[in-house]
């Protein structure tokens, strides 16, 4: 004979749990149902009454099979450096992400907590590691034979462009200026990387540093016993 | 949880050619610059390959010892980042791992054993 | 290219004891510069970049310092766990090097 299927509210056999979906409670001492997410429970279970669930009102919401009394608040809304990535319905949280542009500068449970806008490496300086959504760029200053003219949060230290004659030699922050109409060699977007000449190197000077108002993991240029930070601008 | 997963080692003879893939998740891809590292069976690390990414124009570096013969090359909308070896030669036998995220490496796959031996 | 030297290849400490290693550039790497630590069957982990700069999740026993050639990773009280090997790499300019790597053993 097949075994006999308990409706709740039932007392469980002893030693044994409620099955999935259901809770013990501990007044009626009974098995009864848990709530949907969405909903939370309005009435408890009795002896002879099941659990009463009714619907989560505007901004509260239910994620898991429950029986809590009230639904979780949503969070606040998001401010204007985040996206919201998850609304706030019944059954789930508001999500808020950082806006393009921005790093998760502290983080919570899900989302984050405080965005903070991206470093842009200055000119002489590029980037050595891209932002991410939990950590900041990292500039470095641009070696011999290599330059970057912008100031970005993207932007790579460049090969210097090969000339039959310079007219200007190349620098940290400024490409080499030919003065034949076309240079022998400019590296395309894509080209491997190659080292640069000596004699290229030899034209290099690293960017003076300039105090900035960006956090301390910044590039570091040694300039005395407390640098500032380097390579990298605030904004 | 950021994950890379190197597949296509093996044991291959000089000359041979091979492809390693290295699967990713767990993070932007398409902002991260992708690498390989290989590390010698007497345990020194040496890079090997990078690819940066789309905002920069997808520029490529290697080393020396391996440029000409090994390509590296990345597919963002697979998340997958891989290198084509060519000409292999015995002292390229090492543990190969795919690395990202910028031109030192936050992310480390577990390695792939490449044999090159006749 | 860039050379990276480490020396010596292998280094003896007490638990609780406060270990440096050392790591020298062929030239100026103006502070381009990463630990990594390798434990045994393991891939290597980031644990400093920018010479000084502690990566997310790596515990603050560990240091780094230095400038222009010379750069030093400092462990704070040695625990069994930092049985490893401690390499350096500079990223200041390609190719990518590394140093050959430090075995840290417990004495």
């Known amino acids: 004979l097949p075994a006999q299927v308990a409706f709740t509210p039932y007392a469980p056999e002893p030693g044994s749990t409620c099955r999935l979906r259901e809770y013990y409670d501990q007044t009626a001492q009974m098995c009864c149902s848990k709530c949907s997410p969405g909903q939370h429970a309005k009435v408890f279970c009795t002896k002879t009454s099941d659990t009463v669930c009714d619907s989560c009102e505007d901004s509260t919401y239910t994620q898991l099979w429950n029986w809590v009394p009230e639904c979780l608040s949503c969070g606040s809304r998001c401010s204007s450096d985040q996206v919201e990535t998850q609304a706030c319905t019944r059954e789930q949280n508001r999500i808020c992400t950082c806006r393009p542009g921005w790093y998760c500068a502290l983080s919570k449970q899900e989302g984050c907590r405080l965005c903070a806008p991206l470093r842009k490496c200055r000119p002489g300086f590029g980037v050595a590691r891209p932002g991410t959504e939990t950590s900041d760029v990292v500039c470095k200053p641009c070696a011999p034979g290599t330059f970057s003219n912008t100031t970005s949060s993207t932007d790579i230290c460049r090969p210097h462009q090969i000339c039959n004659v310079v007219a200007i030699p190349g620098n940290a922050s400024m490409d080499a200026v030919c003065t034949s109409t076309s240079p022998t060699r400019s590296m395309a977007p894509g080209a491997v990387h190659l080292p640069q000449p000596v004699s290229t190197r030899s034209q290099h000077t690293q960017p003076t540093p300039e105090p900035s108002t960006a956090p301390s993991t910044s590039f570091l240029l040694p300039m005395g016993p407390s640098p500032p930070a380097e390579g990298s601008t605030g904004d | 949880e950021v994950q890379l997963v190197e597949t296509g080692g093996g044991l291959v003879q000089p000359g041979k050619s091979l492809k390693l893939t290295c699967a990713t998740s767990g993070f932007t891809f398409s902002n991260a610059w992708m690498g390989w590292v290989r590390q010698s069976p007497e345990k020194q690390l040496e890079w090997v390959a990078q690819i940066k990414d789309k905002s920069n124009n997808y520029p490529t570096y290697y080393a020396e010892s391996v440029k000409g013969r090994f390509t590296i090359s990345r597919d963002d909308s697979e998340s997958s980042v891989y290198l084509q070896m060519n000409s292999l030669k015995e002292e390229d036998t090492a543990i190969y791992y795919c690395?990202?995220?910028?031109?030192?490496?936050?992310?480390w796959g577990q390695g792939v054993v490449v044999t090159v031996s006749s | 290219d860039i050379q990276m030297t480490q020396s010596p290849a292998s280094l003896s400490a007490s638990l609780g004891e406060t270990v440096t290693i050392e790591c020298r550039a062929s030239?100026?790497?103006?502070?381009?510069l990463a630990w990594y630590q390798q434990k045994p069957g393991n891939s290597p982990r980031l644990l400093i970049f920018?010479?000084?700069s502690l990566h997310t999740g790596v515990p603050s026993r560990f240091s780094g310092s230095g400038s222009g050639t010379q750069y030093s990773l400092k462990i704070n009280s040695l625990q069994s766990e930092d049985v490893a090997s401690y390499f350096c790499q500079q990223y200041y300019d390609h190719p990518l090097t590394f140093g050959s790597g430090i075995k840290l053993e417990i004495k």
């Open positions: 690395t990202g995220y910028g031109d030192f490496f936050d992310y």
């Open positions: 920018n010479a000084n």
């Open positions: 030239e100026d790497i103006y502070n381009g």
